[in-house]
């Protein structure tokens, strides 16, 4: 098995992800490992010779680049926030900040924007993965009440007026909660839709 | 962990069509963001297309938008590239990729590859 550098008349090598072809000689010469750069080329005599990127630059994969990639923010103006740091042999990872979901992407998010918010009477369906898509409004379950316009207001069980010793004066709706009143005293107009103790 | 399979490699004249799987096993597939790399010989390997774990937020590189289409059914933990137009500069190991967090910035999951030759 040869050991690069060596020679190739196919302009192949046998390793495509971490050799690769130096046509000046005719070679097959090492790439560089994810975290580092060619500081010096290869020849026919002696493989490359790869250094550590510099703070605050990385290279991912195999390579032979000369020079590292600058690591970039996660941009607060485009709504992104750090996951985890830049490090050597990896860029810096972003997502969308709370509240907000991923409205542009790119090969990663590019562009966030604040999640819509839900009318009352429904409730934004959970997802496994917040964050990366809008929300979708689905209407309260039966016996349950929402009554708000908001990205993250979930439905709430209708109040039980037997379980407080009241009982019940007007029924629940997905918009509006069950209105109790003492079992001794009738409803006055005015007060309707209010819990009277 | 996460292993990624890709099949559907080999030669094809140009202007014809391939179809690359991705078939991934071991943890929870359905929230990864998944792509396909590829490398040409004496090229840097390079993003080609990534999808989301619902089917949306694709990405094409320029070179092949209109041409190639990335596509995931969750039931087959599969992921697909379908190649079509091929031309020579298609030429290349291409790699399937899966990160974990889903949101594309670092893909952490990585298939051995498989070769597309496309030549006459």
């Known amino acids: 098995q040869a050991v690069p550098p060596y020679a190739s008349e196919n302009q192949t090598c046998r390793d495509q992800e971490k050799e690769y072809y130096e046509p000046q000689h005719r070679i097959c010469c090492s790439r560089c490992p994810p975290g580092t750069y060619v500081s010096a080329k290869c020849s026919r005599i002696r493989d490359t010779v790869c250094a550590t990127c510099a703070e605050n630059s990385y290279n991912e994969h195999w390579n032979y680049l000369t020079i590292c990639q600058l690591c970039r923010p996660c941009d607060p103006v485009m709504g992104l926030e750090e996951i985890a740091p830049c490090t050597s042999k990896r860029k810096t990872q972003c997502r969308c900040q709370p509240g907000m979901f991923c409205a542009a992407w790119a090969l990663e998010c590019t562009h966030c924007e604040l999640l819509s918010d839900c009318p009352p009477g429904t409730e934004a369906e959970l997802k496994d993965e917040v964050g990366k898509g809008n929300n979708h409004c689905v209407p309260c379950k039966a016996g349950h009440f929402q009554n708000t316009s908001s990205p993250s207001a979930r439905c709430q069980p209708h109040t039980r007026c037997e379980n407080q010793g009241l009982v019940e004066a007007a029924p629940g709706t997905a918009q509006s909660d069950t209105t109790c009143k003492n079992p001794l005293e009738p409803l006055p107009p005015e007060m309707s839709g209010t819990m009277l103790m | 962990e996460v292993q990624l399979v890709e099949s559907g490699g080999g030669l094809v004249q140009p202007g014809g069509s391939l179809r690359l799987s991705c078939a991934a096993s071991?943890?929870?597939?359905?929230?990864?963001?998944m792509a396909w790399f590829r490398q040409a010989p004496g090229k840097e390997r390079e993003a080609v297309a990534a999808i989301n774990w619902n089917g949306g937020g694709t990405y094409y590189a320029d070179s092949v938008k209109g041409r190639f289409t990335i596509s995931r059914d969750n039931a087959k933990n599969t992921v697909y590239l379908q190649m079509n137009s091929l031309r020579p500069e298609d030429t290349a190991v291409y790699y399937c990729?899966?990160?974990?967090?889903?949101?594309?910035?670092?893909?952490?999951?990585w298939g051995q590859g498989t070769l597309v030759t496309v030549s006459s």
């Open positions: 071991g943890r929870t597939f359905t929230n990864y963001r």
């Open positions: 990729a899966a990160d974990s967090t889903g949101w594309g910035s670092y893909f952490d999951y």
